[in-house]
C-alpha cells in the first residue's frame, strides 16, 4: 500500500520559518503534488504550492521556495513574517497524485516539544484520504 510521509521542521535561524518535507512511498509515477495548510486541500485547507514533475512549480505566500528533492519527495520553505505566517501548531498536508495508485494525502505538524532546528525523523503520517 502506498504511503505519504510528512516532516515539519522549524528553522533554528528564523524561529517563524518552517520547512515542510513530504514523500511518497509507492511504485507509481507521480503526476502532481499539492501542499496545503490548515487542513487537507479542498477541505478547508489553503494551497501553498503545487508541484508538477515536468510543467513546473506554482507557490503562494507565505511559501518561500518549493522544490523537488527526489522523484518522489519535495520540500517547501515558508517564510515567517507577516500576518499569514505559520504558527507552531499549524497543520500541513501533502497530497500526491500518482498513476496507477491514485491520490494519497497525509498531514503533519511540528512535534509538540521540538527544539528549533530539530524535528522528528520523517515517518509516514496518517493517510487522511486515498482517492
Amino acid at each position: 500500500t502506498p504511503e505519504v510521509w510528512v516532516q515539519v521542521r522549524m528553522e533554528a535561524t528564523e524561529l517563524s520559518s518552517f520547512t515542510i518535507r513530504c514523500g511518497f512511498l509507492g511504485s507509481g509515477s507521480i503526476s502532481l503534488v499539492t501542499v496545503s495548510w490548515g487542513g487537507p486541500n479542498g477541505a478547508g485547507g489553503t494551497t501553498l504550492a503545487v508541484l508538477h514533475p515536468e510543467r513546473g512549480i506554482r507557490q503562494w505566500a507565505p511559501a518561500r521556495q518549493a522544490r523537488w528533492e527526489t522523484q518522489s519527495s519535495i520540500s517547501l520553505i515558508l517564510e515567517g513574517s507577516g500576518a499569514s505566517s505559520p504558527c507552531a501548531n499549524t497543520t500541513f498536508c501533502c497530497k500526491f497524485a500518482s498513476f496507477p495508485e491514485g491520490s494519497w494525502e497525509a498531514c503533519g505538524s511540528l512535534p509538540p516539544s521540538s527544539d528549533p532546528g530539530l524535528s522528528a525523523p520523517p515517518t509516514p503520517a496518517p493517510i487522511l484520504r486515498a482517492d
Epitope: T47, V50, E54, R55, G56, R58, W60, A61
Partner: antibody
Framework: QVQLQQSGAELVRPGASVKVSCKTS????????IEWVKQRPGQGLEWIGV????????YYNDKFKVKTTLTADKSSSTAYMQLSSLTSDDSAVYFC????????????WGQGTLVTVSA | DIVMTQSQKFISTSVGDRVSITCKAS??????VAWFQQKPGQSPKALIY???TRHTGVPDRFTGSGSGTDFTLTISNVQSEDLADYFC?????????FGGGTKLEIK
C-alpha cells in the same frame, strides 16, 4: 474573446505611487492567474509576480517585493498592481498577462501601461 | 534564480529561410519553457509553451524543441511579418525568468 485592457500611461513624480489596472473580459476571472511583467525601453522582460484572483494567493519576485502590491477585484474582473516609492528605475512598460496554473503560461497579454517617473 | 541565456542577440535571415533561435537554462527546467514574439510597439504574443506545444492560432512554421537546459525555437519558411524580438521564458520555478531576447532581422 479573451481581452486584458490596461489603464493608460502615467507620468509620476519620484517618491510617488501609481496603480495600474488590468480589466479582463471574455473568460471566468477567478479561474485563471494574472501575471505582471516589466519591460524597460529597449530591454528584456522581468517577471514581477502573480495573483490568483480566485483564492487571493500571491507570489512576488523578491526583486519587486518591497515596491509592489498585487490585488484583484472579483466584482469588476480587474487586477491591479500598485508601485510605491517610485524612482527612475521604475520607468517602464508594465504588462499583465493571463496564465493557467500548469498550462498555457502568459497566453494573453494586456497592451501595456507606460509608467514614466520624472521630476 | 534560473538564468535563461539567448546568446544570439541578432539573427539576419531572408524570406523563405529556416532559422533557429536558441535558449539555454542555467539548470534543468525539464520542459517548462515558453517562447514569445514581440513586434515593435506591441505586447508579447505567446507562441510555444511546454517547450514544444503551439498556442492556438500560431502558424505551424513555428516549432519548439528541447528539454532540460537546451531549447530551440525554429521558424521555417520565414515571412516578412516574422520580423520581431523573440524571448524564451522558464516557468519551472519562481522567480520566472526570461531570456534577453533575439532580434530577427529580414535581409
Amino acid at each position: 474573446q479573451v481581452q486584458l485592457q490596461q489603464s493608460g500611461a502615467e507620468l509620476v513624480r519620484p517618491g510617488a505611487s501609481v496603480k495600474v489596472s488590468c480589466k479582463t473580459s471574455g473568460y471566468a476571472f477567478t479561474n485563471y492567474l494574472i501575471e505582471w511583467v516589466k519591460q524597460r525601453p529597449g530591454q528584456g522582460l522581468e517577471w514581477i509576480g502573480v495573483i490568483n484572483p480566485g483564492s487571493g494567493g500571491i507570489y512576488y519576485n523578491d526583486k519587486f517585493k518591497v515596491k509592489t502590491t498585487l490585488t484583484a477585484d472579483k466584482s469588476s474582473s480587474t487586477a491591479y498592481m500598485q508601485l510605491s516609492s517610485l524612482t527612475s528605475d521604475d520607468s517602464a512598460v508594465y504588462f499583465c498577462a493571463r496564465s493557467e496554473t500548469h498550462d498555457t503560461w502568459f497566453a494573453y497579454w494586456g497592451q501595456g501601461t507606460l509608467v514614466t517617473v520624472s521630476a | 534564480d534560473i538564468v535563461m541565456t539567448q546568446s544570439q542577440k541578432f539573427i539576419s535571415t531572408s524570406v523563405g529561410d529556416r532559422v533557429s533561435i536558441t535558449c539555454k537554462a542555467s539548470q534543468s527546467v525539464r520542459i517548462a519553457v515558453a517562447w514569445f514574439q514581440q513586434k515593435p510597439g506591441q505586447s508579447p504574443k505567446a507562441l510555444i509553451y511546454l517547450a514544444s506545444t503551439r498556442h492556438t492560432g500560431v502558424p505551424d512554421r513555428f516549432t519548439g524543441s528541447g528539454s532540460g537546459t537546451d531549447f530551440t525555437l525554429t521558424i521555417s519558411n520565414v515571412q516578412s511579418e516574422d520580423l520581431a524580438d523573440y524571448f524564451c521564458l522558464q516557468h519551472w520555478n519562481y522567480p520566472y525568468t526570461f531570456g534577453g531576447g533575439t532580434k530577427l532581422e529580414i535581409k
